[in-house]
Interface confidence: low
Amino acid sequence: LSTCKTIDMELVKRKRIEAIRGQILSKLRLASPPSQGEVPPGPLPEAVLALYNSTRDRVAGESADPEPEPEADYYAKEVTRVLMVDRNNAIYEKTKDISHSIYMFFNTSDIREAVPEPPLLSRAELRLQRLKSSVEQHVELYQKYSNNSWRYLGNRLLTPTDTPEWLSFDVTGVVRQWLNQGDGIQGARFSAHCSCDSKDNKLHVEINGISPKRRGDLGTIHDMNRPFLLLMATPLERAQHLHSSRHRRALDTNYCFSSTEKNCCVRQLYIDFRKDLGWKWIHEPKGYHANFCLGPCPYIWSLDTQYSKVLALYNQHNPGASASPCCVPQALEPLPIVYYVGRKPKVEQLSNMIVRSCKCS
Amino acid sequence: LSTCKTIDMELVKRKRIEAIRGQILSKLRLASPPSQGEVPPGPLPEAVLALYNSTRDRVAGESADPEPEPEADYYAKEVTRVLMVDRNNAIYEKTKDISHSIYMFFNTSDIREAVPEPPLLSRAELRLQRLKSSVEQHVELYQKYSNNSWRYLGNRLLTPTDTPEWLSFDVTGVVRQWLNQGDGIQGARFSAHCSCDSKDNKLHVEINGISPKRRGDLGTIHDMNRPFLLLMATPLERAQHLHSSRHRRALDTNYCFSSTEKNCCVRQLYIDFRKDLGWKWIHEPKGYHANFCLGPCPYIWSLDTQYSKVLALYNQHNPGASASPCCVPQALEPLPIVYYVGRKPKVEQLSNMIVRSCKCS
């Protein structure tokens, strides 16, 4: 592996090994390796091995590794809203007298208007505005599967609130499924959580635009506040570009072991699109707090350093025991923007735009 | 801000600003800013503003920012197991004939033995071994609150399995609560998910060590396979050291704006504790794939560069639009180890030890 200067691969490995030496001792708060004088002979006790295995084993319910960001995720997503089918539609008739649930139906053709092909969908959220409420209730969301079958999607514990509050459920998989099924009306159900021995199965949560007791008010309910799908998708023309261009590889072990590559605090930086970039084409926002990371992360481990003195520095300066610790963003946030293409305003979400914190890594 | 070389803060800001210029165009797949000739005058249509606000607004149910790792999380955690109270205990008597749930009770004094103070607890998992099953079932976990009250903790959709499978539920908050409540017996309930209009509320999942139909088998069930709490906690003596030493600050805006702190592929590196570190005191594992990151992340944006040529490089080399992109770990995994202190074997989990992938950041 070579850059402007030849990199001594063995030296880098040596430094990494020595850094790991310090890291382990530091994590255990040991100034030196513990003495082995009193260790009993023979294998490890079975209970200890079982405990070790319990800790090591991946089990159902633990979160998997974060997936590397796919190439498509780097690019901006077009954001659209699809409102639920109007409550006056006959499809709601048979759901009227069910006290444990409220129902929402969506027209797949409206969704397809925004997302012509299922793979283009990056994220779909179901957004519901719950009205103020003095009760706590555990609620669930279901997807309509067939005439009499509902698939559980998620749940939420809703605490009392003095003001209306927007709820969001990730329904990306569901919407992708709907898009794969052709046009038609698709349904979702927002229900009370009914426990096995519970008597009160009534849904006490009221949702703007669909709660039965507000039905007479429907004319006055502003469209913007009735349940909707918030869709983020790669526009068709951008997707075609994606397919044709060289794909970015995930920088994981598969790729990196057979490849070559190389090259701490958050600093305040506000970008004013007009002043700093000379741009007038972004209509909202006028600017944003981009920030950036800067500052040294000294490499603080070598064979000739006094162990005990540097252990305390590890946590701050080199927690990852890197051979070349480096100052980088830790938490990043997206930025939604509004701009025009011709006469058409577009809302797009740009991922990883705002640096919130940094780390030595 | 000064390092070995004086850093030109304005130049860094300028580079960051120019990088953002390229980043935004690149994310939108635009070679240059779109023409504004046809943009209608006046404010944005209300619907577009509403969509923009929907995208921008944080709503209930969206995940918050990842918290910076607290200082205590850097250090190793001691791992212990607390088995559920034996099924022969009279406390299980009144739960015998309930078909929708199985019950587990834990002795707080056993938990306190491992975790003397609630804040020392880093993570608690409830582990259950489900037996092979040909049915799919949606199950729920509850915490016992008072005589007749149960608090919902989580759910899981269990698919058919040909082999026994361990399930894990995060119960950190619950166990911390138990530790705050003094000694006694505390309970949890593993139930069928009972939907509001469902007829079949029977729990079809069998759990090793507690499912009713296996009760006669109890003598033959290996203790290791009955439900247990897996606890990870900071040992008391290490915690005292933590309290007394200078705390590491979160590298967030609060701290960093008033402070000074700078430095792409994963490379294979196996650490053999004995050969590479000369250590015999770690009994398990013998070594591990630590890996490391190395490779350039060229800064690929400046005013004199041809826009269209470099846009395609952004995604790979500078997705965060950094002024000094740098090669760092992306996904990290923990490493459990077994070692002795005197005659006493200890199992500890070391966080962020294994580099799985890298990124330019």
Epitope: I221, H222, K286 | G42, P45, L49
Partner: antibody
């Protein structure tokens, strides 16, 4: 939420006046703002609007070139500088909070108004 | 002459339903820009009643409702009460003027 106008009074034709509006009870720096006036016995007339950061301002044709709207977000204060005043500028001037950030899509909260009289 | 046209006065008896109209054009109401309605009681500042065509502002009784067809917007008051006696103004953004415009106002008298 409160909006309190001040700075009104009697002024001669051709003269100048600076109106202020002190805002409290909401995030002023994130709100579009507007000035609306009402001549005695007449209807409402929109005068001007300003975006949250003060980067864009909008004016009615009747006042364009003679008035300047500005804001000081640090002080939570809105201003209307009126020059070359005419007798037809006599009115109660209301400060109002915009429904959206441009201040051009309606006003949800209004001050009590300050009277400007242009007369010799 | 206002860009938005309202009847200058109307009257109704307590308990009745009255509808106040506001006529615009394709550059304002008909252009999809949302309309607001304001109530001004004698001697007081205007108050927002309806925004975005049909959304009631907080604290406004449900006797007040808004609607729109094409370039014609309406404010309907059901179960008229004595305290509803006031001037009512419609307002909307106009893209040809690039300004916000008010209707001339309708004086509602409760008999």
């Amino acid at each position: 939420l409160q909006l309190v106008e001040s700075g009104g009074g009697l002024v001669q034709p051709g003269g100048s006046l600076r109106l202020s509006c002190a805002a409290s009870g909401f995030t002023f720096s994130r709100s579009g703002m507007a000035w609306v006036r009402q001549a005695p016995g007449k209807g409402l007339e929109w005068v001007s609007a300003i975006t949250p950061g003060g980067t864009a301002t909008y004016y009615a044709n009747s006042v364009k070139g003679r008035v300047t709207m500005s804001r000081d977000n640090a002080k939570n204060t809105l201003y209307l500088q009126m020059n070359s005043l005419k007798s037809e500028d006599t009115a109660v001037y209301y400060c109002a909070k915009g429904l959206v950030s441009s201040g051009l899509n309606g006003m949800d909260y209004w001050g009590k108004g300050t009277l400007v009289t242009v007369s010799s | 002459q206002s860009v938005l046209t309202q009847l200058s006065s109307m009257s109704g008896s307590p308990g009745q339903t009255v509808t106040i109209t506001c006529t615009g054009s394709s550059s304002n109401i008909g252009g999809g820009y949302y309309l607001s309605w304001y109530q001004q009681l004698p001697g007081t500042a205007p108050k927002l009643l309806i925004y975005n065509t049909n959304n009631r502002a907080s604290g406004v009784p449900n006797r007040f409702s808004g609607s729109k067809t094409g370039s014609l917007a309406s404010l309907t008051i059901t179960g008229l009460q004595a305290e509803d006696e006031a001037d009512y103004y419609c307002g909307c953004y106009d893209d040809s003027l690039n300004t916000y415009v008010f209707g001339g106002g309708t004086k509602l008298t409760v008999l």
